[in-house]
Interface confidence: medium
């Protein structure tokens, strides 16, 4: 005979665990149904009645199967200088990210408390290490034979073009200038860019019995003037 399928609530066999999407209620001492993402437990189960679930209210969510008595609040509204990359729904938290060209400089579990502009490398300096969602750009002086003529958080030092006859030698901040005869080799026109960091951090981890992989949201602090770009004094 096939084994009977137990309907929640039911008492588990000694030493066994409840099934997927069920939880053991200590008070009722029964296996009971969890609530689906977007819902929460309105009434906990008893020995004779299963969990009663209800939808999360506006601005609240649950991301996992759960039996929490109330849904989690979505994080603070994104500031005007942030980008909302994921809206608050009944099943997911809002995700705010620092705007392009900025990175998170001061974070807490709730997310980023301070977004700061990525450092710009001045002419004569190129990007040695690109910015990430949590670290600033590192600039380095252009080595002999290379140059950068831009103020940029993405441009690296590029080789000078090779001339048959040099009109003006290149330096750290300027390409070589060739005489009217075409150069032997030159870089493709335009600067070489490094990719911008992409921030994909979401807001709060969810305190439920199942592990949550939700990372944390970026909040933006209104900033004063940007810090000076690195490179003019070589510091």
């Amino acid at each position: 005979l096939p084994a009977q399928v137990a309907f929640t609530p039911y008492a588990p066999e000694p030493g066994s665990t409840c099934r997927l999407r069920e939880y053991y209620d200590q008070t009722a001492q029964m296996c009971c149904s969890k609530c689906s993402p977007g819902q929460h437990a309105k009434v906990f189960c008893t020995k004779t009645s299963d969990t009663v679930c209800d939808s999360c209210e506006d601005s609240t969510y649950t991301q996992l199967w759960n039996w929490v008595p109330e849904c989690l609040s979505c994080g603070s509204r994104c500031s005007s200088d942030q980008v909302e990359t994921q809206a608050c729904t009944r099943e997911q938290n809002r995700i705010c990210t620092c705007r392009p060209g900025w990175y998170c400089a001061l974070s807490k579990q709730e997310g980023c408390r301070l977004c700061a502009p990525l450092r710009k490398c001045r002419p004569g300096f190129g990007v040695a290490r690109p910015g990430t969602e949590t670290s600033d750009v590192v600039c380095k002086p252009c080595a002999p034979g290379t140059f950068s003529n831009t103020t940029s958080s993405t441009d690296i030092c590029r080789p000078h073009q090779i001339c048959n006859v040099v009109a003006i030698p290149g330096n750290a901040s300027m390409d070589a200038v060739c005489t009217s005869t075409s150069p032997t080799r030159s870089m493709a026109p335009g600067a070489v860019h490094l990719p911008q960091p992409v921030s994909t951090r979401s807001q709060h981890t969810q305190p439920t019995p199942e592990p949550s992989t939700a990372p944390s949201t970026s909040f933006l602090l209104p900033m004063g003037p940007s810090p000076p770009a690195e490179g003019s004094t070589g510091d």
Partner: antibody, heavy 120, light 111 residues
């Protein structure tokens, strides 16, 4: 306008616990941190910890870890600070304060304070 | 923990004169061009009141005779022209990292 209203004065015996409440109004309670700071008579300010009511996440000064418990009830916009195993040196005024998640990152509105006296 | 040290402990200044309070942090409280240093005023029997946030920003409703300056580890609160209602204890505080810490306070009185 933002207001934080704290519960009344308490007198406790050494070893007991005290729970101070802080009711917030005038802003979205779940959007900002509630910090707790204490001040012994004639002394300076000492940070106990903070809670983010939106998620229940807490941050404690190591000095108070294990003795202080910060909680929040979102439905009534009220934060709580419970301090256990009280000793005479815990006699102080306890303040709650709001700290915005982003913006000032400072405590811009404070409760009126709650005097907790620990005496046998 | 970041230790905040204020100087002087007390200060007596004539009405209309300048009052200057210093605060030194045991390590930098700066991050990406922002100083996470704040100044509070506390009068007897009252909670502290935020005067200056992030080193130099005047809190709404605070008279502009109050100003803040400094970066990294050294900060100053200045009252350009002391008024009778400015008699209070002033505290600096850092919020760069947990635990947030306060200076020991500077008492300002009328000379």
């Amino acid at each position: 306008q933002v207001q934080l209203v704290q519960s009344g004065a308490e007198v406790k015996k050494p070893g007991a616990s005290v729970k101070v409440s802080c009711k917030a109004s005038g802003y979205t309670f779940t959007d900002d941190y509630i910090d707790w700071v204490r001040q012994a008579t004639g002394q300076g300010l000492e940070w106990i910890g903070e809670i983010y009511p939106g998620s229940g996440n807490t941050y404690y000064n190591e000095k108070f870890k294990g003795r202080a418990t910060l909680t929040a009830n979102k439905s009534i916009s009220t934060a709580y600070m419970e301090l256990s195993s009280l000793r005479s040196e815990d006699t102080a005024v306890y303040f709650c304060a709001r700290s915005q998640v982003y913006g000032k990152i400072a405590m811009d509105h404070w409760g009126q304070g709650t005097l907790v006296t620990v005496s046998s | 923990d970041i230790v905040m040290t204020q100087s002087p402990d007390s200060l007596a200044v004539s009405l209309g004169e300048r009052a200057t309070i210093n605060c030194r942090a045991s390590e930098s409280v700066d991050n990406s061009g922002n100083s996470f240093m704040h100044w509070y005023q506390q009068k007897p029997g009252q909670p502290p009141k935020l005067l200056i946030y992030r080193a130099s920003n005047l809190e709404s409703g605070v008279p502009d005779r109050f100003s803040g300056s400094g970066a990294r580890t050294d900060f100053t609160l200045t009252i350009s022209s002391l008024q009778a209602e400015d008699v209070a204890v002033y505290y600096c505080q850092q919020s760069k990292e947990d635990p947030y810490t306060f200076g020991q306070g500077t008492k300002v009185e009328i000379k």
